[in-house]
Structures are given as C-alpha cells and as structure tokens.
Interface confidence: low
C-alpha cells in the first residue's frame, strides 16, 4: 500500500487532481455537529472509504471503514458506509481547531479518488437562545424523500430571518387561498376532488452539489432520520477526483452509528443539508384534474441550479 | 494489531517536568503517525503532538515551548518531555498510533498525569 501510493505520488494520477475540485463550504458554531453523506460507485461497495483531513503534507485519515477501532470516550467523528453507495460521516462537538478542509474518499478499483471534499468553518459559540433552538434538532437526523424542504443556511445575517420568514408567511397565505378557492370552485361545480400534497423543495444559493450536512447541537451520532428535518436537495453528479494521500492525525478515531441502509440503487449524486432551526413547512395542495375522480399528481420541480460557491 | 504501553505518568509540582513514553508491539511496521492525546476530567480529548514517520513534530498551541515530542523508528516508541507544568495539564494523557487507513489506529489505556499547585 505504501509503495502503490508512492507511485502514485511519483508517477501523479490522470484525471484532475486535488486542486480542481472546489471544496463545499460549510459552518457550523462550536459545540454543534455535521453530518455528512457521500456518494460512491456500487462498484466500489467493498473497497475501503476513508474520511481524511487535507494537509499540506496530504491527507490525513480522522476515520476509516476498514476497521472497527475501539477508541476510548472522547470520540468526536464517526463514519458508517450504509451500502448501496451511500458513505455518512458525522463529525461531534465540534471545536475551533476542526476548522479546515476534508474529504471523503475511496480506494477503489482505480485507486484512491475524492468523493467530495468539505471546507469547514467554525464559528464562535450561539448565544443560549440560538443553541436551544438547534438543539430542538438534535434527536433528529434526516431521510432523503423525492421532495424535500430547505431551511436557512446557519451562516446567513440574523437580520434577513425576519424578512424570510415574512416572505415564506405571505407566500404560505397566498397558496393557501388559491388552494382554498379552487377547493370551493372545484365543490360548486359538484365535481370530485383528488388531492396531492407535496412538499415544496427549494434551493440555497452559493452551495456546491455535494454531501448531505446534517448541523445540529447534539453530541452524538445520529440515529433514526425523520422527514421533518429541513435539508436540501441539490442534484449534480460527484466529481471524482483522483489523489494521492498520507496520514497524519488530529482527531479520535471513530465508532460507527447505525442507520438504515438505502435500497440499492445507482450512486445518487451527493447532497447538502444545514439545518440551523426549526422550520415550518407549508403544504401545497393540487386539486386533481382526472375526470374519472383519480388524483394526479406530479412532483414540485426544483428550479434549476447553476450556482457555484464564489471563492 | 498494535498494542500500545504508557509509562511515566504521576503526580508533579506545578513547574515541574515529566517525561511519558510509549511502547508499540504488534504489527508494528505500518505505523504512520504516532501521536500523544489527553483528556482532563469533563473536557474533550485533544492532540497534545504527534510525529510522521519522516515528519515533523506537530504540537496544540498549549504544548508549544513547553512539551517536546520525538519518536525512535527502530524501536517503536515515542516519548513526550513536559517541561514547566501547569494545573491545566492535570489529565489523562494517551499513546496513539495511526497506521496506514487500511489498517486503522490504535490507542493506549492511558497514563494519568496530576499537576499539584
């Protein structure tokens, strides 16, 4: 192993290297958690996945699938690889010195390659307030349904909330009389009425398609996943970036919290969740336009998203 | 595997000095990184210094100047000089070894370190 990385870092790989690939930018105060999820290739289900720390000198292993370490108390990262392409990362208690650049990666068949790679922000502790607020998140964790719903980034100005909230409130009232006028329409006219809820999904500007980041209070590992988390749904396919690597530790190593595994379907492109506090979702209701009194039902479209985090 | 012994642990006057080591055994060869953590009561384990095989000694900001770390390849282990101890430094101080990622890493059981004033 060593000497193949050797090579490689003689011989350097095809493809683009470590520099290319921006990192996603994620912040999250001191004492919350991340929580990460790359997207590898089925081809790649047995081979090892590592989350690593990018020095100068490499990248350094924090937490590895190959083994099962028994660290003592004091853990802070911990990685589970559910199958089926899916590799989850959460990282605890997060303190000043985590600020910095990560990655997920995979020794597959054509060797090592970043799945993803994350620049961690740090900022300085919330205000007791803000902290019971994440921290109403903290039992939760995340499933991944076809629509899903996106909170505020935790890193926006505190002063644009009132004004979102506003403007979620205004929207909300206006859908929901649309929705309660067409129910009337649709009743005076003795027809039958299908209805289909959906969630609205929505995306966050700046963000690089990526890993799913789950951002809470709480100190543990993640357990059952829940639909009312707020997260966001970003959809571009994984760049794989070929590298060499060395180690270099800063952290604990890791146990492995349990989760479902996904179904075992392609590789999903990676995604991206901040969650800061509690949202509430508005429903949107489509009458149904069957004559035979059948509901239809399409999925809400997610505008398109082109964005790319600005350096 | 990687069995990993600490020694050199006890009870110090503040401003005084202790000097840790390390012993690794086992499937030695592919140690990486060794490394010292600790952990005070209440508080979460930290890096205190480590050292790559051909690399330089990293130390935490609180070690610097103080705390010195150096590690004999041939024989597996790493010691840690502390100098000018303080009562912050009280604390339960582990032995770390990372191997290469394939492999994993591997601690020590710990080896208590009491700063009096």
């Known amino acids: 192993m060593g000497l193949t990385l050797l090579l490689l870092l003689l011989l350097g790989l095809e493809g683009q290297g470590i520099v290319g690939s921006l990192p996603e930018v994620l912040q999250a105060p001191v004492g919350s958690s991340i929580l990460v999820q790359c997207h590898y290739r089925l081809q790649d289900v047995k081979a090892q996945k590592v989350w690593c720390r990018f020095l100068p000198e490499g990248c350094q292993p924090l937490v590895s699938s190959a083994v099962d370490r028994r660290a003592p108390a004091g853990r802070r990262t911990f990685l589970t690889d559910l199958g089926g392409g899916l590799l989850q990362v959460e990282m605890v208690t997060l303190q000043e010195e985590d600020a910095g650049e990560y990655g997920c990666m995979v020794d597959g068949a054509r060797g090592p390659q970043i799945l993803h790679r994350v620049s961690l922000n740090i900022l300085p502790p919330e205000e007791e307030e803000e902290t019971h607020k994440i921290g109403s998140l903290a039992e939760n964790a995340f499933s991944d349904p076809a629509g899903s719903a996106n909170p505020l980034e935790p890193s926006q100005d505190e002063k644009s909330i009132p004004l979102i909230w506003g403007a979620v409130l205004l929207v909300g009232l206006l859908v929901a009389a649309v929705v309660l006028f067409a129910v009337m329409a649709k009743r005076k006219q003795g027809n039958r009425l299908g209805v289909c809820g959906r969630f609205l999904s929505s995306r966050v500007s700046g963000m690089n398609p990526s890993s799913v980041v789950h951002h809470v209070s709480d100190s543990g590992p993640a357990a059952e996943l829940p639909l009312d988390v707020p997260h966001i749904r970003l959809d571009s396919p994984p760049s794989f970036d070929n590298t060499t690597y060395t180690s270099l530790p800063l952290d604990s190593p890791s146990g492995k919290p349990s989760l479902p595994a996904p179904s075992s379907l392609p590789p999903l492109p990676p995604k991206v969740l901040v969650c800061s506090k509690p949202v509430t979702y508005a429903t949107v209701i489509f009458p149904g336009g069957n004559k035979g009194g059948g509901t239809s039902c399409g999925p809400a479209q997610n505008p398109p998203n082109n964005q790319t985090p600005s350096s | 595997q990687v069995q990993l012994v600490e020694s050199g642990g006890g009870l110090v006057q503040a401003g005084g000095s202790l000097t840790l080591s390390c012993a690794a055994s086992?499937?030695?060869?592919?140690?990486?990184?060794m490394a010292w953590y600790r952990q005070a009561p209440g508080k979460q384990r930290e890096l205190v210094a480590n050292?790559?095989?051909?690399?330089?000694?990293k130390y935490a900001d609180f070690a610097k100047g103080r705390f010195t770390i150096s590690r004999d390849n041939t024989k597996n282990t790493i010691s840690l000089q502390m100098n000018s101890l303080k009562p912050e430094d009280t604390a339960v101080y582990y032995c770390?070894?990372?191997?290469?990622?394939?492999?994993?890493?591997?601690w020590g059981q710990g080896t208590q370190v009491t700063v009096s004033s």
């Open positions: 770390n070894a990372l191997l290469d990622w394939r492999l994993g890493d591997y």
């Open positions: 050292k790559a095989r051909g690399g330089l000694p």
């Open positions: 086992g499937s030695t060869s592919g140690i990486n990184v």
